[in-house]
Interface confidence: low
């Protein structure tokens, strides 16, 4: 069973958290975004999302970096920094950010109901939207499924 908590999309960029903890590798992040018909965002795409109101308090993969987008300073989020804060001391597992090029150019908070590009598989995947709505499907999104249950998930605090 996998729970994927996802946010609203801001200029196509959104945050995905798996099973309530940092548990996504960079390889899995790319696979997961692909399953959402998305890609890992570029820094420019993340900065655009930030400019229209996107912020989180979770480290996640983008293309080439692990970041937290911050608008308001908060001592427990990105060490009080604002902007797209880049983590320098990387470990292996975080959340991920994804970019959907067909999303509206502004903020889109309608519920995501499925993983459109997932393929057949036995795993129960639950998509949890920010408004609490949950959608369940069976499937798989990994190209490297042996890594589905990481033997050593990190549970870092931000």
């Amino acid at each position: 069973q996998i729970d994927l908590n996802i946010t609203c999309r801001f200029a196509g960029v959104f945050h995905v958290e798996k099973n309530g903890r940092y548990s996504i590798s960079r390889t899995e992040a790319a696979d997961l975004c692909k399953a959402f018909n998305s890609t890992l965002p570029t820094m420019a795409q993340m900065e655009k999302a930030l400019s229209i109101g996107f912020e989180t308090c979770r480290y996640g993969f983008i293309e080439g970096h692990v970041v937290i987008p911050r608008i308001h300073p908060n001592s427990i989020c990105a060490a009080n920094n604002t902007g797209v804060y880049i983590l320098t001391s990387n470990t292996s597992q975080y959340d991920t950010y994804c970019f959907n090029a067909s999303a509206p150019p502004e903020e889109d908070c309608t519920s995501v109901t499925d993983l459109p590009n997932a393929f057949d598989g036995p795993i129960t995947i639950t998509i949890v939207n920010r408004d609490g709505t949950r959608y369940v499907q069976k499937g798989e999104y990994r190209t490297n499924p042996e890594d589905i249950y990481p033997s050593n998930p990190t549970d870092d605090d931000v």
Epitope: E106, D108, C109, T110
Partner: antibody, heavy 117, light 108 residues
Framework: QVQLVQSGAEVKKPGASVKVSCKAS????????MHWVRQAPGQRLEWMGW????????KYSQKFQGRVTITRDTSASTAYMELSSLRSEDTAVYYC??????????WGQGTLVTVSS | EIVLTQSPGTLSLSPGERATLSCRAS???????LAWYQQKPGQAPRLLIY???SRATGIPDRFSGSGSGTDFTLTISRLEPEDFAVYYC?????????FGGGTKVEIK
């Protein structure tokens, strides 16, 4: 600016139905789910359900399942909440709300529904 | 259903004082999907905090939220006259979405 404007107060008899409207402006209506929440006098806020304004999908609180229907008219940027089989304990202020966005969480001004024989 | 219990029910304080409001959940709130609202008589609730600790647009920095799992706190660092109101917590990590019973912050 973003605004949700609700229809006016209603007085209904027990067993009747009421339909409250919520007109949205200042943003793309179909980009956000719309929720309905009620507040009986002196009581806590109570979530009733939501509609995905993009595709029309709805989700209702089990407490109201079968009595509440939430719909939308995208051409009018308006959401509707209809509650049937009214009883006196349904007397409350009913709010529409656009939840959880980085740009804030606008609510309608509220619609007082009084159920009285 | 996640039940949210707020305490205290009423908080009597003077302007300039610090207010600490508590919200306890009957089970863990998914991904800290917890919000705080302020409500004044005759008005709709106003979002203060979402995601347990993120301030909504236009909310003064004297309001701050913290916590995770089952225990959450709203802190108002220095009460202004306009802050005297009822405050509600709400979880939106699982359906049905639920609200706490509220804490009334009144002038001492």
């Amino acid at each position: 600016q973003v605004q949700l404007v609700q229809s006016g107060a209603e007085v209904k008899k027990p067993g009747a139905s009421v339909k409250v409207s919520c007109k949205a402006s200042g943003y793309t209506f179909t980009n956000y789910a719309m929720h309905w929440v009620r507040q009986a006098p002196g009581q806590r806020l109570e979530w009733m359900g939501w509609i995905n304004t993009g595709n029309g999908n709805t989700k209702y609180s089990q407490k109201f399942q079968g009595r509440v229907t939430i719909t939308r008219d995208t051409s009018a940027s308006t959401a509707y909440m209809e509650l049937s089989s009214l009883r006196s304990e349904d007397t409350a202020v009913y709010y529409c709300a656009r939840f959880y966005s980085g740009s804030g969480s606008p609510w309608g001004q509220g619609t007082l529904v009084t159920v009285s024989s | 259903e996640i039940v949210l219990t707020q305490s205290p029910g009423t908080l009597s304080l003077s302007p300039g004082e610090r207010a600490t409001l508590s919200c306890r959940a009957s089970q863990s709130v998914s991904s800290s999907y917890l919000a705080w609202y302020q409500q004044k008589p005759g008005q709709a609730p106003r979002l203060l905090i979402y995601g347990a600790s993120s301030r909504a647009t236009g909310i003064p920095d004297r309001f701050s939220g913290s916590g995770s799992g089952t225990d959450f706190t709203l802190t108002i660092s220095r009460l202004e006259p306009e802050d005297f109101a009822v405050y509600y917590c709400q979880q939106y990590g699982s359906s049905p979405l639920t609200f706490g019973g509220g804490t009334k912050v009144e002038i001492k």
